[in-house]
Interface confidence: low
């Protein structure tokens, strides 16, 4: 049997566990009307703030201040286990890793904990193996190590070559920088860049509302307001209108299904992306514009930004032809809802494109390799890679760019059996419409 | 039927590097850990280290200074290097996968490789 | 590291015979958590690389004759053959498999007497 692989972030609690929170319980209110793109305006900036907060709040809580650890033996949550532990063979019980032993970071469902990372001589410990987290080495002081060669600690230069000065010294991760005197080069015949390094001490919260984050952030809502009375005058809208429907205009819109996606977890992220999405000149030429409505766009304002932009995609050669828009069957969220799917892919695309995949959807090298390391076993590599592009992106992490990566690798046939099969696991469906105004 | 095959130089001098290669046929590669046991003539068995598919690699303290073990995907391989050896490296090389789900004992073995170092 | 010590080092018995060799940690092997101990057992016969034959301690291998059992628990364990046959002459290893680096016993050679 082959171990499982990890599922999910540590911060987000693996799957989504929401409970009726109290957003969620909100009811709509009767009020003043005001118009729309102005209430969504401000949404978006207040959902920055407290994205930002949020952020912060979690990552800087100490270790005392974080949820109190589980017990040796819990059940496990939706078949899954919290960090720390690991799932029993008959998947009822959830068993503690083995302190300095080994650990798992992400609620999961493996049968056995990963082991603990050993630091290589030449290297000292930063941070013992927790349960929940694997040991961090550094290199001695006085060595580094190098992308290229990730496995040993080289030892930093002492000293500059003749008419080099030095203008960074040896560190864990680089060697000392030289520089040319006269021009300025660094030693490898770069132009050194001004690097503006910010440090924060690891004891030290942020200020979770500096002056700075303020002023952009009534900036941006500022500029955001000016675009988005511009962008619902301007024929982008009328063309978006269709998918978009009520937004701008004060009546016409269906406010209840507005208010029931603010009521789902999530949805004012989307909402949000809509809106950024939509004011993205620079990804919409005009003649891309050309899209015709479909004849009733439900649930269409629960498209994640990746999913819109494809409703400003060129017009294919047989229109026909074209794929139609996916989305969440029971109207979730659609990167969490992917992510559910994330399990059956290895089997369905071949092995050889998962690294060229996963650069297409933007992961880097070093990315690749650490969800390499992470995966417990062969299948689940491209799991833990696809986990890591969620993560990464977030909710521009859509069905649709993943779809399109593959087109673009050449993998149709991979492309294929994945539509077919988020179609028939019943998590996905075509949006409801015409054939023709079906989108990309 | 899952078979080891492991192959490499058997006669070694003193300093010299012992690379052997382990390759896995007819079974699934990921999944398990890989490694590598060594048994010098008449005495115990000694856990060298492992590996897994993505390169992730465990090694034995008394050892992992002179000790390399990569992997090879494409070719279902597995490789040991041993650097600088002496006399007390001469012993049986095994390859073996580690259980299923990754525990730490070994449910299949190569047929050993004996090594001899010698001036 | 965990030292693995087995006791004897050969033993010989008759045909039919009970054989027991015993299996002794430098430190516990039971893991409280999921109550299992993580050892091993294996035979190895000349010229041939080790057989696995029981693991958590108790768990016959598939395949591995039911004469062949495992008992025990934190620090001490023993593999018996309820009855010595012919193709039992072998070496027998525990091992630990509760932390690295992995280590075995020094083996109990099992003759016929």
């Known amino acids: 049997m082959e171990q499982r692989g990890q599922n999910a972030p540590a911060a987000s609690g693996a799957r989504k566990r929401h409970g009726p929170g109290p957003r969620e319980a909100r009811g709509a209110r009767p009020g003043p009307r005001v118009p729309k793109t102005l209430v969504l305006v401000v949404a978006a900036v207040l959902l920055l703030v407290s994205a930002e907060s949020a952020l912060i709040t979690q990552q800087d809580l100490a270790p005392q201040q974080r949820a109190a650890p589980q017990q040796k033996r819990s059940s496990p949550s939706e078949g899954l286990c919290p960090p720390g532990h690991h799932i029993s063979e008959d998947g009822r019980d959830c068993i503690s890793c083995k302190y300095g032993q080994d650990y798992s970071t992400h609620w999961n469902d493996l049968l056995f904990c990963l082991r603990c990372t050993r630091c290589d001589s030449g290297e000292v410990e930063l941070s013992p193996c927790t349960t929940t987290r694997n040991t961090v080495c550094q290199c001695e002081e006085g060595t580094f190590r190098e992308e290229d060669s990730p496995e040993m600690c080289r030892k930093c230069r002492t000293g500059c070559p003749r008419g080099m000065v030095k203008v960074g010294d040896c560190t864990p991760w680089s060697d000392i920088e030289c520089v040319h005197k006269e021009s300025g080069t660094k030693h490898s015949g770069e132009v050194p860049a001004v690097e503006e390094t910010v440090t924060s001490s690891p004891g030290t919260p942020a200020s979770p509302c500096s002056l700075s984050g303020i002023i952009i952030g009534v900036t941006v809502a500022a500029v955001v307001l000016i675009v988005a009375v511009f962008v619902c005058k301007s024929l982008l809208w009328k063309k978006v209108l269709p998918y978009l429907k009520g937004i701008c205009s004060g009546g016409g819109g269906d406010p209840e299904r507005v208010d029931r996606s603010s009521q789902r977890p999530g949805a004012e992220d989307n909402v949000l992306n809509e809106i950024v999405s939509i004011l993205q000149p620079t990804q919409v030429p005009e003649q891309e514009m050309e899209v015709q409505e479909p004849a009733e766009p439900t649930g269409v304002n629960m498209l994640s930004p990746g999913e819109s932009e494809h409703l400003l995609e060129p017009a294919e050669a047989e229109r026909s032809q074209r794929r139609r828009l996916l989305v969440p069957a029971n109207e979730g969220d659609p990167t969490e809802t992917l992510r559910q799917c994330f399990d059956d892919f290895a089997d369905l695309v071949p092995f050889d494109s998962w690294e060229p995949l996963m650069r297409k959807l933007g992961l880097m090298d070093n990315e690749i390799k650490v969800a390499k390391a992470e995966a417990a076993g062969h299948r689940d590599t491209l799991y833990t890679m696809l986990i890591k592009w969620v993560n990464k992106t977030g909710r521009d992490a859509s069905v649709h760019t993943l779809l399109d990566a593959l087109e673009t690798l050449g993998e149709r046939l991979a492309k294929q059996k994945i539509e077919d099969h988020l179609l028939s696991s019943g998590k996905f469906m075509y949006l409801e419409g015409n054939a023709d105004s079906a989108m990309s | 039927q899952v078979q080891l095959q492991q192959w490499g130089a058997r006669l070694l001098k003193p300093s010299e590097t012992l690379s052997l290669t382990c390759a896995v046929y007819?079974?699934?590669?990921?999944?398990?850990?890989w490694s590598w046991i060594r048994q010098p003539p008449g005495k115990g068995l000694e856990w060298i280290g492992e590996?897994?598919?993505?390169?992730?690699?465990n090694y034995n303290p008394s050892l992992k200074s002179r000790v390399t073990i990569s992997v090879d995907t494409s070719k279902n391989q597995f490789s040991l290097k041993l650097r600088s050896v002496t006399a007390a490296d001469t012993a049986v090389y095994y390859c073996?996968?580690?259980?299923?789900?990754?525990?730490?004992?070994?449910?299949?073995w190569g047929r050993g490789t004996l090594v001899t170092v010698s001036s | 590291d965990i030292v693995m010590t087995q006791s004897p080092d050969s033993l010989a018995v008759s045909l039919g015979e009970r054989a027991t060799i015993n299996c002794k940690s430098s430190?516990?092997?039971?893991?409280?958590?999921?109550?299992?101990?993580?050892l091993v057992w294996y035979q190895q016969k000349p010229g041939q690389p080790p057989k696995l034959l029981i693991y958590?301690?108790?768990t016959r291998e598939s395949g591995v004759p039911d004469r062949f059992s495992g008992s025990g628990s934190g620090t001490d364990f023993t593999l018996t053959i309820s009855s010595l046959q012919a193709e039992d002459v072998a070496v027998y290893y525990c091992?630990?498999?509760?932390?690295?680096?992995?280590?075995f016993g020094g083996g109990t050679k099992v003759e016929i007497k």
């Open positions: 007819g079974g699934s590669f990921s999944g398990y850990y």
């Open positions: 590996i897994n598919h993505s390169g992730s690699t």
């Open positions: 430190q516990s092997v039971l893991h409280s958590s999921n109550n299992k101990n993580y």
């Open positions: 073996a996968r580690g259980g299923s789900s990754g525990y730490w004992y070994f449910d299949l």
């Open positions: 091992q630990q498999y509760y932390s690295t680096p992995l280590t």
């Open positions: 958590w301690a108790s």
